[in-house]
Interface confidence: low
């Protein structure tokens, strides 16, 4: 059928809770494309009816919730004007007995569920919640060894748990929990995170590679809306933070009042050897003050910038 096959790594998932997977594969999905999801090489596409427990939501496949029988290989077919790519995703579902230590822990966890804190430093854990915009996520609660985390050293900031002055006692089994609302129904999302402590300073030894941007300028008309992706490849065990800054300040903080320029939600695609992360910056309306400023994408120790410039006048 002329489609190029791309195989993603296995995803190991907890039964009885929501799960979503976004069929994005930059740069394939950046243009005008159609995305269709299938299960186990079926010719019948996954339903697009939002009441269905499993359905396609734009480029996402959404399970509300995931169940035992959902294990299998799912394919999303990305068709462009002159191209076709078929991405294979192997989903394995298991039953997690959260606080029953007699049953044992999680199986081979995917890497976002293994995180590292650096001894003596201020560090953070990230709750990876990847869902389409039809899903509304409530505030996140954090647990350690099945007890809700409280204390002065811990601060919940959006999807992160900030830990100040990390100690050896901070290693262990964590979980983040959020209530997800979709079409008036509520579901609990729980991610288990195995946390280890390292004395190694810095960024876990990995230097992320920023694929885009490349320290360049972008021509953009005054008043237009602009979205720019920052694409980063990094090792699977990385603990690097990825964000957009301007004047050495997070864009969400810098434009806190107007909210005219915002950082998007980070997404990632897992490959066998590395992860590809995408976090965008959205200019709701480009203003004169934006021109000439370097907007910096940071990924650990790596940085890259874009500079907006007015298009050259057309004298024709």
């Amino acid at each position: 059928d002329g489609c190029k096959d791309i195989f993603m790594k296995n995803e190991i998932l907890s039964a009885s809770q929501p799960f979503a997977f976004n069929c994005t594969f930059p740069p394939i999905t950046s243009g005008e494309v159609s995305v269709t999801w299938y299960k186990n090489s079926s010719k019948i596409p996954v339903s697009k009816i939002i009441q269905s427990r499993i359905h396609q939501d734009e480029t996402w496949i959404l399970f509300l919730p995931m169940e035992w029988g959902d294990s299998g290989v799912y394919q999303c077919v990305i068709k462009g004007r002159d191209s076709c790519h078929r991405i294979h995703v192997n989903l394995t579902v298991f039953e997690k007995h959260w606080c029953d230590t007699s049953i044992g822990g999680l199986p081979n966890l995917s890497d976002e569920y293994k995180q590292i804190l650096h001894l003596g430093k201020d560090d953070s854990l990230t709750c990876h919640l990847h869902f389409p915009k039809s899903c509304v996520l409530g505030p996140i609660k954090w647990y350690k060894d099945c007890n809700e985390i409280k204390g002065e050293r811990f601060t919940v900031l959006e999807t992160r748990l900030l830990v100040s002055n990390v100690s050896a006692e901070d290693r262990g089994n964590y979980a983040c929990q959020a209530i997800l609302t979709h079409s008036g129904k509520q579901y609990e999302v729980l991610n288990g995170i195995t946390v280890s402590i390292t004395e190694r300073a810095g960024y876990g030894g990995s230097v992320p590679k920023i694929i885009y941007p490349k320290n360049h300028s972008i021509e953009v008309q005054l008043g237009t809306t602009l979205i720019v992706d920052c694409n980063v490849t990094d090792t699977k065990d990385n603990t690097n933070l990825r964000c957009w800054r301007v004047n050495n300040t997070l864009v969400d903080d810098y434009y806190d009042e107007s909210k005219r320029i915002r950082e998007g939600v980070e997404t990632h695609v897992s490959f066998r050897e590395h992860n590809l992360y995408t976090v965008n910056i959205t200019f709701l309306e480009v203003k004169m003050e934006d021109y000439g400023l370097p907007f910096m994408c940071h990924a650990g120790v790596s940085t890259a910038y874009i500079i907006l410039q007015l298009p050259a006048p057309d004298f024709r």
Epitope: Q17, P18, W98, C99, K141, E148, Q186, Y187, E188
Partner: nanobody
Framework: EVQLVESGGGLVQPGGSLRLSCAAS????????LGWYRQAPGKQREAVAT????????YYSDSVKGRFTISQDNAKTTVYLQMNSLRAEDTAVYYC?????????????????????SGQGTLVTVSS
Amino acid sequence: EVQLVESGGGLVQPGGSLRLSCAASGYSYRTQCLGWYRQAPGKQREAVATISGGGTSTYYSDSVKGRFTISQDNAKTTVYLQMNSLRAEDTAVYYCAAGLSVLGSWCHGGSSYEYTYSGQGTLVTVSS
């Protein structure tokens, strides 16, 4: 809007049985720890029995172990509490609770009450 509606309470003689039901609407239960707690006049509330959303694990307080059984229907939208060999000290208002994280200590016999939703309660009176 999430609603939990209890039923089945009433007056029963010591040694008798009752079956409480809790029907949920507007809520997808499957991932939650569901259960019952009770509060007698002038006493602290007590977790009586809980069941994980998948039905794979249950918890009973020592005071009801062997006498009470918690279960769910197949659709996991109704939770039952079968109460046998009732005693006078079982007299209390029984509340259905849901929306609690399965990580919350209440689900495993702890003393914190982190459930998100709770019903209006149904009175159980054990008296001769």
